[in-house]
Interface confidence: low
């Protein structure tokens, strides 16, 4: 790359009136070679009588420069711009610990100015992620951490996360948080967060996807409240009462645990047997009263009804006509009825 031309370049060029030192309007920027595509480095300086590139401390051949020159209308100073092309082969042929670099050197009558070093690197992105996310089953509202360390690459890969192929935007959904080291945090897992999550690494060379991590948000079952105790199932004597509950508060979901414990509880109960009422025998007929009737009675006490037993059917009191005893018979008139 050395050329005798550059050995003869003076430190300054005699000129009148004196010029300022060259000032870089544009400095070369770092560049990446993708596959076999060469890169262009470009710089621009004013005032500049000469401008050339130096790469890895060696001058680039004059014929490899594309130079343009013009006069700045406002300042009247000469503006020079230059570009060179760097191939993959050139970068690969460099031996030593340092990366391939180039810098611009511009001259004016006042002296020389060097631009910053622009590094030229071969871009790549390895295929294998250094850490891939781990699928998990998590309970509702639990925090979930999905880790991702992207494959090694130049330039360093950017990372984004996909939820079922859709890009996660933590600004849009505040339940997601992406840490500085590319981990995805689901702050409180929701049922809607049950999905396939993929870490995507990309740079100018390629885009790589991690293996998919399946996150399943499960719900453990919870018991409903107990029903009221049933009535004793025996109408008479020993039996049981029961109450029930169901595993529906909530029902288990996505492989969540079924409720532990009993869904039915029973307790012993004793119901007093009902006793139906029965009549006592009729009493003797009473003596015949003044109204020519006599009566007899009985009571529902042999036994009396108990514990919801049936009452006795029929009359407590019976009366009928009589004509003996104190019965006073009178002739019938329109107001009286004789009882026989």
């Amino acid at each position: 790359q050395d050329d005798d031309f550059f050995h003869e370049l003076p430190e300054t060029f005699p000129s009148d009136p004196p010029e300022p030192l060259p000032h870089f309007l544009i400095e070369p920027e770092e560049a990446y070679i993708v596959k076999n595509k060469p890169v262009n480095l470009y710089c621009k300086a004013s005032p500049a009588t000469q401008i050339y590139f130096k790469c890895n401390s060696e001058w680039v051949h004059q014929k490899d420069h594309i130079v343009d020159e013009r006069v700045d209308e406002t300042s009247g100073l000469i503006v020079r711009e230059v570009s060179i092309e760097i191939s993959r082969q050139q970068v690969e042929e460099l031996f030593g610990p340092e990366d391939y670099w180039c810098q611009c050197v511009a001259w004016s009558s006042a002296g020389t100015t060097k631009s910053r070093k622009a590094y030229v690197r071969i871009a790549y992105l390895r295929k294998t992620f250094e850490q891939e996310p781990l699928g998990k089953e998590v309970s509702l509202e639990q925090e979930v951490l999905l880790q991702c360390r992207p494959p090694e690459g130049i330039p360093v890969a950017e990372v984004e996360w996909l939820k079922n192929e859709d890009i996660i935007d933590p600004v849009e959904d505040r339940n997601f948080y992406i840490t500085i080291d590319h981990n995805l945090i689901i702050k409180q897992a929701r049922l809607s967060d049950t999905a396939n999550y993929t870490c995507v690494a990309k740079n100018i060379v390629a885009k790589r996807k991690s293996t998919t991590a399946t996150v399943i948000v499960y719900v453990n079952g919870g018991w409903s409240t107990w029903t009221e105790w049933s009535v004793c199932n025996s109408r008479c004597g020993r039996g049981y009462q029961k109450r029930t509950r169901t595993c529906t508060n909530p029902a288990p979901l996505n492989g969540g645990a079924f409720c532990e414990g009993q869904s039915v509880q029973k307790i012993a109960c004793t119901t007093l047997c009902p006793v139906d009422g029965r009549w006592t025998p009729w009493s003797k007929w009473s003596t015949c009263g003044t109204e020519c009737t006599h009566w007899r009675r009985r009571e529902c006490t042999a036994p009396a009804p108990k514990n919801g037993g049936k009452d006795c059917d029929g009359l407590v009191l019976q009366s009928k006509n009589c004509t003996d005893g104190l019965c006073m018979q009178t002739a019938p008139d329109s107001d009286d009825v004789a009882l026989y």
Epitope: L134, G135, E137, V138, S139, L145, G255
Partner: antibody
Framework: QVQLQESGPGLVKPSETLSLTCTVS????????WSWIRQPPGKGLEWIGY???????NYNPSLKSRVTISVDTSKNHFSLKLSSVTAADTAVYYC?????????????WGQGTLVTVSS | DIQMTQSPSSLSASVGDRVTITCRAS??????LNWYQQKPGKAPKLLIY???SLQSGVPSRFSGSGSGTDFTLTISSLQPEDFATYYC?????????FGGGTKVEIK
């Protein structure tokens, strides 16, 4: 009660492929993470990898280039293939169920099967 | 990978003793830690998950504590059936890794 049972040859020749199957009974293969773990004689436990019934796999990077884990939900079993084996792969191989939750504990294990790599 | 370091690697104790096993992670793993018991010729058995939750059917003399990088398994009163090897396991990130084990022997 969930039960896991490993099956496969107890002797494999160097450079060949080790193949094991784990049959799951008493429960569904769905919604869990099914792992293979091995233990060389007199040594500690080493996780090989897992598969979810969705087909998602995750392998130990130290074995990744040689491991394949697959699942057959219709037969309720999952399988391990480890290629290019050497004597260093001699171990008791366990299949285990990862119960999920954030800490992925292995709550059910097979009884283990000893695989010897020898010519 | 996250390294899990258990200590001690073995200990001798008597029935009725209080036994403590520690597990240290090479980086913070929150509460993503499980403990297992393994007896010779048998598969490991889950004792504690999520650092401190007791697995169903495990006696209450087993308890777990800790968060971040330092965790402890405690057996409050050692029983004859507790002589075994105990392992911790992290699931903060893959690859899932186990501690080297602590063998509890009869004094």
């Amino acid at each position: 009660q969930v039960q896991l049972q490993e099956s496969g040859p107890g002797l494999v020749k160097p450079s060949e492929t080790l193949s094991l199957t784990c049959t799951v009974s008493g429960g569904s293969i769905s919604s869990y993470f099914w792992s293979w773990i091995r233990q060389p004689p007199g040594k500690g436990l080493e996780w090989i990898g897992y598969i979810h019934n969705s087909g998602t796999t995750n392998y130990n990077p130290s074995l990744k280039s040689r491991v394949t884990i697959s699942v057959d939900t219709s037969k309720n079993h999952f399988s391990l293939k480890l290629s290019s084996v050497t004597a260093a792969d001699t171990a008791v191989y366990y299949c285990a169920r990862g119960r999920g939750m954030a800490t992925l504990p292995f709550d059910y294990w097979g009884q283990g099967t000893l695989v010897t790599v020898s010519s | 990978d996250i390294q899990m370091t258990q200590s001690p690697s073995s200990l001798s104790a008597s029935v009725g003793d209080r036994v403590t096993i520690t597990c240290r992670a090479s980086q913070s793993i929150s509460s993503y830690l499980n403990w297992y018991q393994q007896k010779p010729g048998k598969a490991p058995k889950l004792l504690i998950y999520a650092a401190s939750s007791l697995q169903s059917g495990v006696p209450s003399r087993f308890s777990g504590s800790g968060s971040g990088t330092d965790f402890t398994l405690t057996i409050s009163s050692l029983q004859p059936e507790d002589f075994a090897t105990y392992y911790c396991q992290q699931s903060y990130s893959t690859p899932l890794t186990f501690g080297g084990g602590t063998k509890v022997e009869i004094k």
